[in-house]
Amino acid sequence: SEVEYRAEVGQNAYLPCFYTPAAPGNLVPVCWGKGACPVFECGNVVLRTDERDVNYWTSRYWLNGDFRKGDVSLTIENVTLADSGIYCCRIQIPGIMNDEKFNLKLVIKPAKVTPAPTRQRDFTAAFPRMLTTRGHGPAETQTLGSLPDINLTQISTLANELRDSRLANDLRDSGATIRIG
């Protein structure tokens, strides 16, 4: 099943996807597509990278993070209701059937006419810079700058933990983004 992310009409949506390059600058091709990941590539490609650079993109879709460090999270600018749906992030790791694929579900909500002031933001639209975890002994806090190197399995595990409603209550709004896939 897909991980769900949310954004409001008119906002930018953020769909996280990561990998750890084997060595700095040793990149692998990545594609983003609208629709669930098929057997090969991405259907309806909106953005693509090779080992050096972004080599294909369409308007409103871009990589805001440092893709040279493996942050291939997709930003969709000024979303509309039509942007709702499944997106595929495919990390085309060389070798036989090595590529990693992630299906992410984007839910677009109508814009609020009069947004009520609130300290808490929908954590699936924008993760804060600081994440406090609990439920596993003493609370520990990690800033973005001190996050350890993590592999795809750890990313997936962390994403699952973030979806836990207990953790959602600990997310504080500081206007930055934890980039996890």
Epitope: P29, A36, V39, E41, P94, M97
Partner: antibody
Framework: EVQLVESGGGLVRPGGSLKLSCVVS????????MHWVPQAPEKGLDWIAY?????????????YYADTVKGRFTISRDNAKNTLFLQMTSLRSEDTAMYYC?????????????WGQGTSVTVSS | QIVLTQSPAIMSASPGKKVTLTCSAS???????LYWYQQKPGSSPKLWIY???NLASGVPARFSGSGSGTSYSLTISSMEAEDAASYFC?????????FGGGTKLEIK
């Protein structure tokens, strides 16, 4: 004009080997994934191998095989020569078919949009 | 793997008649990744319909495609002699990609 031209087919004994080639023109070969699809006489189509494009070097491709050819067939590409290969070993009579190469168009139609004319492989003693 | 079953295996139709070919999947297929190919004797396959309902370049408007889940179809609104060929469906939603066994369409 997009063109794909296969070669290398022929008659081979069971257990033997063949190397098929597919030379392409009319598009930027390195940008596109490529497939091999055999068609047994009077039968349907049967996908067997895929190699991804979008890589600068030929060695950094993602590869997929059908279970029926895993360990026996090897797909590869030489981007500098605009050529796709299929190395076939331990050939069996059931490998007898017309072998087509096909382009995987991720930009527009997202699948096997152009096919070669095929090269015939017969495995028989 | 997903098995695609095409029916009928062989059919003949008179010019001007409506023709419907079906492709049934053993489990659900994303409509984005269900394709149809046309093949004439001695020729290689040609992409005919992509993503269930989109006609490939040069395909006459009398052709259409529809379906979802496990049931897909290709329809010719008015059969013409040049439509006589074999038609294969393909899914590449799930590994491995699979083709249907084909329908051979003949002109009466």
């Amino acid at each position: 004009e997009v063109q794909l031209v296969e070669s290398g087919g022929g008659l081979v004994r069971p257990g033997g080997s063949l190397k098929l080639s597919c030379v392409v023109s009319g598009f930027t070969f390195s940008d596109y994934g490529m497939h091999w699809v055999p068609q047994a006489p009077e039968k349907g189509l049967d996908w067997i191998a895929y190699i991804s494009g979008g890589s600068i070097s030929s060695g950094s491709s993602t590869i997929y095989y059908a279970d029926t050819v895993k360990g026996r067939f090897t797909i590869s590409r030489d981007n500098a020569k605009n050529t796709l290969f299929l190395q076939m070993t331990s050939l069996r009579s059931e490998d007898t078919a017309m072998y087509y190469c096909a382009r995987h168009d991720w930009r527009g139609l997202y699948a096997m949009d152009y096919w070669g004319q095929g090269t015939s492989v017969t495995v028989s003693s | 793997q997903i098995v695609l079953t095409q029916s009928p295996a062989i059919m003949s139709a008179s010019p001007g008649k409506k023709v419907t070919l079906t492709c049934s999947a053993s489990s659900s297929v994303s409509s984005s990744y269900l394709y149809w190919y046309q093949q004439k004797p001695g020729s290689s396959p040609k992409l005919w319909i992509y993503s269930t309902s989109n006609l490939a370049s040069g395909v006459p408007a009398r052709f259409s495609g529809s379906g979802s889940g496990t049931s897909y179809s290709l329809t010719i609104s008015s059969m013409e002699a040049e439509d006589a060929a074999s038609y294969f469906c393909l899914q590449w939603s799930s590994y491995p990609p699979t083709f249907g066994g084909g329908t051979k369409l003949e002109i009466k």
